[in-house]
């Protein structure tokens, strides 16, 4: 005997003596029986019988929201007038991906509009899109469970050379954007100071062109260009970079006075204001937040404050006059 065994007996509520099958049949003209809620939904004002003209409200379980008209009305013939209503998931569940792939940010649930980035170990790239966005109850584009990492052709080609270069005999020469970049490489968001425009470029093409001394090309972020804070900061960072005394190569990027190159990710990471060293003659006169007082800050402090998205108005380069 198992208490979990199901022999098809109808349920009995703890406080009721009768099985549901023993309840008297309801006459149609005396109202409506309880309607069937949509999947992942329930009836808020639940009862056995509803009067003609009475409304029931459909609610959704946590993590779901109602889409459509969420009220049913009891009609004189004992049926319900109900529009199309469904409970749609408001969050996406963390996708199941192959172990070699890293999900950033790593959470159990993601809200609509939130994005994830899939990355691979050094020397490998995602064999497909790397950025996915939660839309309703699914990821866009859909995440294939066979998605994996593949050897980065850039790494293979470059040998002992720097990114954007390839080995030619015993020396390193720049890759040709046309000839050497026909293979798949991850998308980067890039800014061109000449055209004052940003666009999505394959990593191989960007690095090859940068190697060929196209100094007007600036890396903004990994992944295709999408409006948002990351792009906004990328553009502001490019403007500030012209005055930076430090220009340290770091993966696809170049790190400036207010940044540190992360050894483990090969990405430039903003320092926090207290990590700025006082030295440097690149000074700015600024106004912080809603303050009316002026303050002299160095380029590192300005960069870290703007990177942290704190409100600051640059009044002019150089020390404050007062």
């Amino acid at each position: 005997f198992s208490i979990m065994e199901n022999n098809g007996q109808p349920c009995i509520n703890d406080d009721e003596e009768m099985k549901e099958v023993d309840l008297p049949e309801i006459e149609a003209d005396s109202g409506c029986p309880q309607p069937v809620p949509p999947e992942n939904g329930f009836i808020r004002n639940e009862k056995q019988l509803y009067l003609v003209g009475e409304d029931v409200e459909i609610s959704c379980l946590t993590g779901f929201e109602t889409v459509g008209y969420q009220y049913f009305r009891c009609l004189p013939d004992g049926t319900w007038r109900q529009g199309d209503v469904e409970c749609q998931r408001t969050e996406c569940i963390k996708p199941v991906v192959q172990e070699v792939l890293t999900i950033t940010p790593f959470q159990r649930l993601y809200r609509i509009g939130e994005s994830i980035e899939l990355t691979c170990p050094k020397g490998f790239v995602v064999a497909g899109p790397s950025r996915y966005t939660c839309q309703g109850n699914s990821w866009t584009p859909p995440i294939s469970n066979s998605l994996t990492c593949e050897k980065d052709t850039l790494t293979k080609l470059k040998g002992h050379c720097q990114l954007g270069q390839k080995q030619s005999g015993s020396e390193c020469i720049c890759m040709s954007p046309e000839e050497d970049c026909s293979h798949h490489s991850e998308d980067l968001c890039v800014f061109d100071t000449d055209s004052n425009d940003y666009f999505t470029s394959p990593a191989c093409k960007f690095l090859a062109e940068k190697c060929l001394n196209n100094q007007q090309l600036h890396f903004l972020h990994i992944g295709s260009c999408q409006d948002g804070r990351q792009l906004e900061w990328g553009l502001e960072r490019t403007r500030l970079s012209s005055n930076s005394t430090k220009k340290e190569s770091c993966g696809y990027d170049t790190c400036y006075d207010w940044e540190k190159c992360s050894a483990s990710t090969s990405k430039c990471v903003c320092l926090l204001p207290p990590q700025c060293f006082k030295g440097g003659n690149q000074l700015y006169c600024v106004k912080m937040g809603s303050s009316t007082s002026e303050k002299t800050l160095n380029i590192c402090e300005v960069g870290t404050i703007r990177c942290a998205n704190r409100k600051m108005e640059i009044l002019h380069p150089g020390k404050c006059l007062a």
Epitope: T104, Q107, W233, S262, K278, G279, K295, C307, A308
Partner: antibody
Framework: EVQLVESGGGLVQPGGSLKLSCAAS????????MAWVRQGPGKGLEWVAT????????YYRESVKGRFTISRDNAKNSLYLQMDSLRAEDTAVYYC???????????WGHGTLVTVSS | DVVLTQTPLTLSVTPGQPVSISCRSS???????????LYWYLQKPGQSPQLLIY???DLGSGVPNRFSGSGSGTDFTLKISRVEAEDVGVYYC?????????FGAGTRLELK
């Protein structure tokens, strides 16, 4: 070699005051922000306050605002923490800390014990 | 304030064994430009804390490479590939992505 040596700790009654000092050496003191971090008995670590290069900007944790004052004297290579209206929950070992490009608290002193009790 | 929950609270290990400490944040530490300010410290008995890992996975200066950090968003891990006697102490995670900076309650590592 970076060295930070705290002093000024001791036993004080609730409502009382105490001034902690931190003597810095082995680096150009005026070129760095500085901070105080504390550790209550058998408790974890807690950031207390931070000061910029010349003392023109200070930052405090909410529970000490209005009671504690962080200051510095660059000529003496010294950092201070003036603690007024002390409470029992301020009992802790107080550490002086300096940042680096790696972290906000990269270098620490050995700490000085402050006990607030009647 | 951001709460950092460390597990386990105590670890008793045999030298040479691997160890893993978890740090879970009450909110995501990934900021809107893609940076995560998560650090790991070790406080050896009778000493002040020392930096082990910064920015989730970068090794602090002079830290042996048996230490490694990983994670993103709200879940972070410190791993020691082979525990040595000198690794005994309390391990703390710390975040600086949101003000005020906060520390985890600590994980005590002792030898069997």
């Amino acid at each position: 070699e970076v060295q930070l040596v705290e002093s000024g700790g001791g036993l004080v009654q609730p409502g009382g005051s105490l001034k902690l000092s931190c003597a810095a050496s082995g680096f150009t003191f005026r070129d760095y922000y500085m901070a105080w971090v504390r550790q209550g008995p058998g408790k974890g670590l807690e950031w207390v306050a931070t000061i910029n290069y010349d003392g023109s900007s200070t930052y405090y944790r909410e529970s000490v605002k209005g009671r504690f004052t962080i200051s510095r004297d660059n000529a003496k290579n010294s950092l201070y923490l003036q603690m007024d209206s002390l409470r029992a929950e301020d009992t802790a070992v107080y550490y002086c800390a300096r940042p680096s490009t790696e972290a906000l608290f990269a270098y620490w002193g050995h700490g000085t014990l402050v006990t607030v009790s009647s | 304030d951001v709460v950092l929950t460390q597990t386990p609270l105590t670890l008793s290990v045999t030298p040479g064994q691997p160890v893993s400490i978890s740090c879970r944040s009450s909110q995501s530490l990934l900021n809107d430009v893609g940076n995560t300010y998560l650090y790991w410290y070790l406080q050896k008995p009778g000493q002040s804390p020392q930096l082990l890992i910064y920015l989730v996975s970068d090794l602090g200066s002079g830290v042996p490479n048996r230490f490694s950090g990983s994670g993103s968003g709200t879940d972070f891990t410190l791993k020691i590939s082979r525990v040595e006697a000198e690794d005994v102490g309390v391990y703390y995670c710390m975040q600086a992505s949101h003000a005020p900076y906060t520390f985890g309650a600590g994980t005590r590592l002792e030898l069997k």
